[in-house]
């Protein structure tokens, strides 16, 4: 409504608002305000939100439902919960992927993209923390592998291979000359 006034409504409960002649009750979640009430403290005409729109608030006076968000496929997002008349689509990442926020101060409504989780097994490492809200945290090398540089190297299977000190400590034998 135009103007800046917000007249007080002498109606039972706090969910009334002056719309034209009368103070009208608000609409329930999942509905939008189609027509004002036609008597004091009366019920507004409220209709169910059309498909692909929603309104999450109770006792509101919104005349339009909000459009449901579409999950960003370019950012590898998927719908964890589909949109309903009372709740927006909940976007997230599919199993094996984690949320990477696109802003430094990350909140639930911040833009994000999905990154594939690190596969510790493929790196021949123990999984210390499973990937969900952040990337997988990999631990030490799996049995039969030893630390070499940034990676895990397979223990030699024959005495012909070289086995530095760290290899020997993990793999349990020294190179023979």
């Amino acid at each position: 409504q135009g103007g800046t006034r917000s007249p007080r409504c002498d109606c039972a409960g706090d969910f009334h608002k002056k719309i034209g002649l009368f103070c009208c009750r608000g609409c329930p979640a999942g509905h939008y305000l189609k027509a004002p009430c036609t008597e004091p403290c009366g019920n507004s005409t409220c209709l169910v939100c059309p498909q692909d729109t929603f309104l999450a608030w109770e006792n509101h006076h919104n005349s339009e439902c909000a459009r449901c968000q579409a999950c960003d496929e370019q950012a590898s997002q998927v719908a964890l919960e589909n949109c309903s008349a009372v709740a927006d689509t909940r976007c997230g990442c599919k199993p094996g992927w984690f949320v990477e926020c696109q802003v430094s101060q990350c909140v639930s409504s911040s833009p994000f993209y999905c990154q594939p989780c690190l596969d510790c097994g493929a790196l021949h490492r123990h999984t210390r923390l499973l990937c969900s809200r952040r990337d997988t945290d990999c631990g030490t090398c799996l049995p039969g592998f030893y630390e070499h540089g940034d990676g895990c190297v397979s223990c030699p299977t024959s005495t012909l291979g070289s086995c530095p000190e760290r290899c020997a400590a993990v793999c349990g034998w020294r190179q023979m000359f």
Partner: antibody, heavy 124, light 107 residues
Amino acid sequence: QVQLVQSGGGLVQPGGSLRLSCAASGFTFSSYSMNWVRQAPGKGLEWVSYISSSSSTIYYADSVKGRFTISRDNAKNSLYLQMNSLRAEDTAVYYCARWDGYCSGGSCYSGMDYWGQGTLVTVS
Amino acid sequence: DIEMTQSPSSLSASVGDKVTITCQASQDISNYLNWYQQKPGKAPKLLIYDASNLETGVPSRFSGSGSGTDSTFTISSLQPEDIATYYCQQYDNLPLTFGGGTKVEIK
């Protein structure tokens, strides 16, 4: 299409009574509030009375309070105005008018969107 | 009661002229204002609701503006069929009240 057809006007003596009718068609009469508005000869428009769709809310202008009675019969799609103790100053063309309201784009609107053809009441 | 003061009470203009009518409420009525057109011997017709919204089927030469206590009704280019009396009406409060009307004539 929406139509409001009025009847019941005429000449009446001061102190007399008259009943105006307004027959509605082309819309769901029981869903709308209705009004009576009058216009004295050569004068402007004056609101007379309001009745909600279910008849639970009724209002009158001070000038007719206690003398006029608005009513409706949703089964017959009809609106009425019973006028008693008529005075010379009640002489006017009386209109019935539908009160419509709707909300869109963050605002709500109300107004008399359809009117009857009018019926002349002469008190003399 | 909310008093609606409309001016001028009458005006005469040429075809094609811009015509402006003002309506002043005795208190803040927000946007709760309608404009009606009444041709001689006919019932009024709703032209503009909520101060500035054109009713369906009404020519775009008609417009309205304003909020609070002051509202304006404009005919951008007067046509012979616009000869009528125009009324503003508030619906902020009961009783519903109309302005005194503005009679528009062609020179």
